[in-house]
Amino acid sequence: HTAAQDNCTCPTNKMTVCSPDGPGGRCQCRALGSGMAVDCSTLTSKCLLLKARMSAPKNARTLVRPSEHALVDNDGLYDPDCDPEGRFKARQCNQTSVCWCVNSVGVRRTDKGDLSLRCDELVRTHHILIDLRHRPTAGAFNHSDLDAELRRLFRERYRLHPKFVAAVHYEQPTIQIELRQNTSQKAAGDVDIGDAAYYFERDIKGESLFQGRGGLDLRVRGEPLQVERTLIYYLDEIPPKFSMKRLTA
């Protein structure tokens, strides 16, 4: 057991298995479920994280998967197909040959169909609105302090460039964080807004994906910011294609 083995961990993803068996004895970590090698200097893609989550023993799951008829709090949990880069494949199918198209954050964007369903491309989610309600506090948070703290959080914890945090809106007790990232804006090495939003969502739920770190301790000028509910809205570069039947339901 060497020091190298002690150091061989994945700080950004605890759902991995690591060993110093990479090229030249370097540390290499693989995601549970998929066995894909992951880059531990940055966030792991949501697709690989969902796959790892679904591969975990049933009793290790902290959340109950809701029925497919549930409209609110549907965790969107399914065992996804990921491409060699760890992104969601445009078409996802379940074990009963029901298929649907997803966007880059793995959210369904078409009606469900059968194996003949075609999803020509993975449509990018370029705008994410994170809607939070915080627990009552003595007074409202200072907007500019809140803005700075959330930008700092997304940079320092989730490695997201501040330019992708488009705005932070606040009307007590509601906080809205807008993330925007067009295909043309995202450079190699940039964290994807969808991955950052997913890590944030899991942190807020007390299910941190980081290795050995304490949970998220959000404070604005020393005052704890405790979130009591979260809603996340996804806007795609190409609008979703749902039938009128669904829209009028």
């Epitope: 020091a3 150091n7 061989c8 970590c29 320092e156 450079a187």
Partner: antibody
Framework: QQLEESGGGLVKPEGSLTLTCKGS????????WMWWVRQAPGKGLEWIA?????????TYYASWAKGRFTISSTSSTAVTLQATSLTAADTATYFC???????????????WGPGTLVTVSS | FEMTQTPSSVSEPVGGTVTIKCQAS??????LGWYQQKPGQPPKLLIY???TLASGVPSRFKGSGSGTEFTLTISDLEPADAATYYC????????????FGGGTEVVVK
């Protein structure tokens, strides 16, 4: 714990070279970043590139270094910097340094090599 | 993104106090380091996280600030403090810009 650079010396303009950084007392297999930083004679410090030496080998490059400099880590004991199309402006002492955290955006350098001098001249 | 360090040179007597300022063109929170470099030597980390003293560094060195304005204060100057001091951040490394300040030469009279 120590770092040592090698590979410096006299290079002709338009030439190329490879610098190597080796560590002793620790493995380049942890959850941190290794950096190359340079300093022209009598001038300030400027970073060239870091590489993550844990799982993944992520890299970043200074704008001016893209295309001419390549950082790599093929083993758990060394990091290399390859430089091409060198000019007199690349004459400098080249340092390797270890970043103290896993987060590249919150990095500071807690261990430095003594540096190796590269002189580009005909 | 740019780090602006002032002054470029300062001279103070033994026992005096020197203040070096570093300004970031954008908010970098508390992600700033200070280094001391003597001729022919590599830089030495003095302070990280804007105000935390690195191991073995005397408490005469004090770092402060956050956001865009930072200060290094060296009190009770000693001859051994004669060196060039640099501030540094990697907060915007993905923009490909240099995160080091231009340096401040401290002369101890």
């Amino acid at each position: 714990q120590q770092l040592e650079e090698s590979g410096g010396g006299l290079v002709k303009p338009e030439g190329s070279l490879t610098l190597t950084c080796k560590g002793s007392g620790f493995d380049f297999s942890g959850t941190y970043w290794m950096w190359w930083v340079r300093q022209a004679p009598g001038k300030g410090l400027e970073w060239i590139a870091p590489i993550y030496v844990g799982s993944g080998s992520s890299t970043y490059y200074a704008s001016w270094a893209k295309g001419r400099f390549t950082i790599s880590s093929t083993s758990s004991t060394a990091v290399t910097l390859q430089a091409t199309s060198l000019t007199a402006a690349d004459t400098a002492t080249y340092f390797c340094a270890r970043g103290a955290t896993n987060n590249v955006f919150m990095n500071y350098f807690n261990l430095w090599g003594p540096g190796t001098l590269v002189t580009v001249s005909s | 993104f740019e780090m602006t360090q002032t002054p470029s040179s300062v001279s103070e007597p033994v026992g005096g106090t020197v203040t070096i300022k570093c300004q970031a063109s954008e908010d970098i929170s508390s992600n700033l380091g200070w280094y001391q470099q003597k001729p022919g030597q590599p830089p030495k980390l003095l302070i990280y996280g804007a105000s935390t003293l690195a191991s073995g560094v005397p408490s005469r060195f004090k770092g402060s600030g956050s956001g865009t304005e930072f200060t290094l204060t060296i009190s009770d100057l000693e001859p051994a403090d004669a060196a060039t001091y640099y501030c540094q951040t990697s907060y915007y490394i993905d923009d490909g810009v240099n995160g080091f300040g231009g340096g401040t030469e401290v002369v101890v009279k």
